[in-house]
Interface confidence: medium
């Protein structure tokens, strides 16, 4: 049929939760492409009716919520003008019984992310929640070892969980709750994280540092494509992600439709005791609505933004 | 000009103790890693231990073959270098080397490299 | 632990001659390799850093090149006080370690 095929990581999830997965792969999702996910070579595609348990919502596909008989390889297609391409994700689907004592507590499955704390230092913890517009997040509750965290050494802050003056203590089973809701209908999900503790000090403690954008503006003229690089400096061992957005929005989902700005794929270099990542913004075709807009790289707890502004007229051309 | 002198080598019995010391001088010492190299007679250059700079928390890593035996540190209102060798062998008989690192870190560029070698302090281990 | 592997081990070169040196990493050290020059009953110098950066006060004739696990020491027109023995040292991770050494002499 003429796909190229890709094969991404296996994803192990938990029964009875709201998951999704994304079919990006940029740069081929960075054009006018189109996306239709499949289950286990199948020739029908995955139903895009919102009430389905299993549908495809744009280009994700969410599940609402995981059954065990989910399990298999799922494909997503995309195809541009041009091209065809083919992921495979392998979904692993297992019982959770979070705090089932009984089984010990916290199973230890390679879903659960681990993160770790810098002792000493104020730090934190980040709820990893990926799912599609349509599905709305509440507030994120946080246990250890099945016990609601509360203490004033603790904040909920959006999707993370800042920790100050971090103990050995701290180490252990974690677990974020949320309550996602789709078309009235509410759902749980909960994330379990192994958390270590760890002396050493990476360059200026654990929070990554953004080399490029410096809160800035550029010059660009109207209609020109632009590319620019976000350049963070992190630990090895850190957990954040990299990002850009607009409008507190991930760019490729603030211009979902048009794919007129996109995230590119992000690459490292790997240094002796700390990592440079690169992940680049492209605008295809600046337009005036982008002028005066901050674009804000994101790396964990930093941030850094540019503004794009149009160039100065040169009055030598009159 | 950047200087580094190494002292505290001699003739020790296996399972005897010894303490190297190196002066530093012509650089800001709490901005530089520190190094100790060995050579053995006639053998290759051996990485022995590092420790960071300030910037890094002074944190320090041993090869295996020190590791629970040779303690690095620094005093730097000293810019000395020290390396305390516990329970010696004879396979640590060599010259031992202060080096600088010139590890530089502003948060983008790094260069790895061992920049300036003090000229060397022999440690014979023999009974 | 990454091991350095340097060959030769003797290269034997007249003078005015050109001279490659090899290193090889067991395993990916981007472009974390340096080189050194020891002379007889002398520390080692610094020669090349980051793979082809020459070091402060070193010839124009010496040039080094690679990335990843292969990496070469070039010297292009051999002078007599080049004669001696070259390390290469990978230092991506811990435990910073060097090749065996490759000792240049005079043919």
């Known amino acids: 049929d003429g796909c190229k095929d890709i094969f991404m990581k296996n994803e192990i999830l938990s029964a009875s939760q709201p998951f999704a997965f994304n079919c990006t792969f940029p740069p081929i999702t960075s054009g006018e492409v189109s996306v239709t996910w499949y289950k286990n070579s199948s020739k029908i595609p995955v139903s895009k009716i919102i009430q389905s348990r299993i549908h495809q919502d744009e280009t994700w596909i969410l599940f609402l919520p995981m059954e065990w008989g989910d399990s298999g390889v799922y494909q997503c297609v995309i195809k541009g003008r041009d091209s065809c391409h083919r992921i495979h994700v392998n979904l692993t689907v297992f019982e959770k019984h979070w705090c089932d004592t009984s089984i010990g507590g916290l199973p230890n499955l390679s879903d659960e992310y681990k993160q770790i704390l810098h002792l000493g230092k104020d730090d934190s913890l980040t709820c990893h929640l990926h799912f599609p517009k349509s599905c709305v997040l509440g507030p994120i509750k946080w246990y250890k070892d099945c016990n609601e965290i509360k203490g004033e050494r603790f904040t909920v802050l959006e999707t993370r969980l800042l920790v100050s003056n971090v103990s050995a203590e701290d180490r252990g089973n974690y677990a974020c709750q949320a309550i996602l809701t789709h078309s009235g209908k509410q759902y749980e999900v909960l994330n379990g994280i192994t958390v270590s503790i760890t002396e050493r000090a990476g360059y200026g403690g654990s929070v990554p540092k953004i080399i490029y954008p410096k809160n800035h503006s550029i010059e660009v003229q109207l209609g020109t494509t632009l590319i620019v690089d976000c350049n963070v400096t992190d630990t090895k061992d850190n957990t954040n992600l990299r990002c850009w957005r607009v409008n507190n929005t991930l760019v490729d989902d603030y211009y979902d439709e048009s794919k007129r700005i996109r995230e590119g794929v992000e690459t490292h270099v790997s240094f002796r005791e700390h990592n440079l990542y690169t992940v680049n913004i492209t605008f295809l075709e600046v337009k005036m609505e982008d002028y005066g807009l901050p674009f804000m790289c994101h790396a964990g707890v930093s941030t850094a933004y540019i503004i794009l502004q149009l160039p100065a007229p040169d009055f030598r051309a009159y | 000009q950047v200087q580094l002198q190494e002292s505290g080598g001699g003739l020790v019995k296996p399972g005897g103790s010894l303490r190297l010391s190196c002066a530093a001088s012509?650089?800001?010492?709490?901005?530089?890693?520190m190094n100790w190299i060995r050579q053995a007679p006639g053998k290759g250059l051996e990485w022995v231990s590092l420790i960071r700079n300030k910037a890094a928390g002074y944190t320090i890593y041993y090869a295996d073959s020190v590791k629970g035996r040779f303690t690095i540190s620094r005093d730097n209102a000293k810019s000395s270098l020290y390396l305390q060798m516990n329970s010696l062998r004879a396979e640590d008989t060599a010259v031992y080397y202060c080096?600088?690192?010139?590890?530089?870190?502003?948060?983008?560029?790094?260069?790895?490299?061992?920049?300036?070698w003090g000229q060397g302090t022999l440690v014979t281990v023999s009974s | 632990e990454i091991v350095m592997t340097q060959s030769p081990a003797t290269l034997s070169v007249s003078p005015g001659e050109r001279a490659t040196l090899s290193c090889r990493a067991s395993?990916?050290?981007?472009?974390?390799l340096s080189w050194y020059q020891q002379k007889p009953g002398q520390a080692p110098r610094l020669f090349i850093y980051?793979?082809?950066n020459l070091h402060t006060g070193v010839p124009a004739r010496f040039s080094g090149s690679g990335s990843g696990t292969e990496f070469t020491l070039t010297i292009s027109s051999l002078q007599s006080e080049d004669f001696a023995v070259y390390y290469c040292l990978q230092s991506q991770s811990y435990p910073l370690t060097f090749g065996q050494g490759t000792k240049l002499e005079i043919k």
């Open positions: 080096v600088r690192d010139m590890t530089i870190y502003d948060g983008y560029y790094v260069d790895y490299a061992l920049d300036y």
């Open positions: 012509g650089f800001a010492f709490t901005d530089y890693y």
């Open positions: 980051k793979a082809s």
């Open positions: 395993q990916n050290i981007n472009i974390w």
